[in-house]
């Protein structure tokens, strides 16, 4: 029998390599059984996760899972960093793994590094 606890499906140590100026949607996949929980995004600052209050978010519903989306329109260099989503469920706070955005500000698409290069060249990142 599947658990009816809320589950947040962000992979541990997940990373996204994205380009400043582009739109980007950061998804927090949420599984729940009955009432949809209240979900928020925060950005890690050292060991503290600072709640993102005034950011555009939305829900996308699919058959077996819902997605709480943090919108970047557009991505800015200072969006670089690690993010976490959290759900309030029956007075419990459930936290996802953090996911890291690596933002690069190259001038043209032809200069964009590959995902592998992004992972191995942190000096490219803001």
């Amino acid at each position: 029998k599947e658990s009816c606890d809320v589950q947040l499906y962000i992979k541990r140590q997940s990373e996204h390599s994205i380009l400043a100026g582009d739109p980007f949607e950061l998804e927090c996949p949420v599984k729940y059984c009955a009432n949809r929980p209240h979900v928020t995004w925060c950005k890690l600052n050292g060991t503290t996760c600072v709640k993102l209050e005034d950011r555009q978010t939305s829900w996308k519903e699919e058959k077996n899972i819902s997605f709480f989306i943090l919108h970047f329109e557009p991505v800015l260099p200072n969006d670089n960093g690690s993010y976490r989503c959290s759900a309030n469920f029956q007075s419990n706070l459930i936290e996802s793994h953090s996911t890291t955005l690596y933002v690069t500000d190259v001038k043209s698409a032809s200069e964009r590094p590959s995902k592998d290069e992004m992972a191995s060249r942190p000096w490219l990142l803001y």
Epitope: I10, K11, R12, S14, H16, K115, A119
Partner: antibody, heavy 119, light 112 residues
């Protein structure tokens, strides 16, 4: 039934390349990280790197950076390891392993495929 | 890179007796999420590795409860409470807290 089946091993000339496949079934590859690990005869396990099939992000051990490429095709539930500039010391059994990325709920290993680098 | 050092390199234990394998990491494996990503793998002769234990002490499904894992920070232990003939294998610890992920050198468990 969960399965990881590696293929593509065999005899390769020094300086040559190989591309190994890891066909998975019984789970959604996008929910996992795919690792490639090798083991020379009578030796221990050596981590080559890992791929996130959900977005293509890849990490490598330093000794394989620039020489190894790990990728995945989630539509085929299959992962790949390409290794270039092969040397005799690359002779080993190559394993793929699939570890669930969210809650560590499973960690499956394939049976391995033997690669022999020799002239 | 994090160095994982297992002891002993080999171990001979009588059937029904307790077997203990140690694994020491060169730095803490405690992740920033408060969890410790330390696995134990079993590799029987001629077979591929199999995950026995993850997150230091959680047993994979189907793993007999004579296996247990313990430890924290940099020091970890795999214990087999009552050795069975089918436990003859090489055991590896593996950390996947810090990149690059690294294995211990392995401990060969033999029947005395």
């Amino acid at each position: 039934e969960v399965q990881l089946v590696e293929s593509g091993g065999g005899l390769v000339q020094p300086g040559g390349s190989l591309k190994l496949s890891c066909a998975t079934s019984g789970f959604n590859i996008k929910d996992t990280y795919i690792h490639w690990v090798r083991q020379a005869s009578g030796k221990g396990l050596e981590w080559i790197g890992r791929n996130d099939p959900a977005n293509g992000n890849t990490k490598y051990a330093a000794s394989f950076k620039g020489r190894a490429t790990i990728s995945a095709d989630d539509s085929k539930n299959t992962a790949y390891l390409q290794l270039n500039s092969l040397k005799t010391e690359d002779t080993a059994v190559y394993y793929c392993a699939s570890y669930e990325g969210y809650y560590e709920r499973f960690g499956y290993w394939g049976q391995g495929t033997l690669v022999t680098v020799s002239s | 890179d994090i160095v994982m050092t297992q002891s002993p390199d080999s171990l001979a234990v009588s059937l029904g007796e307790r077997a203990t394998i140690n694994c020491k990491s060169s730095q803490s494996l405690l992740d920033r999420d408060g969890k410790t990503y330390l696995n134990w793998l079993q590799q029987k002769p001629g077979q591929s590795p199999k995950r026995l234990i993850y997150l230091v002490s959680k047993l994979d499904s189907g793993v007999p409860d004579r296996f247990s894992g313990s430890g924290s920070g940099t020091d970890f232990t795999l214990t087999i409470s009552s050795l069975q003939a089918e436990d003859l294998a090489v055991y590896y610890c593996w950390q996947d807290t810090h990149f690059p992920y690294t294995f211990g050198q392995g401990t060969k468990l033999e029947i005395k």
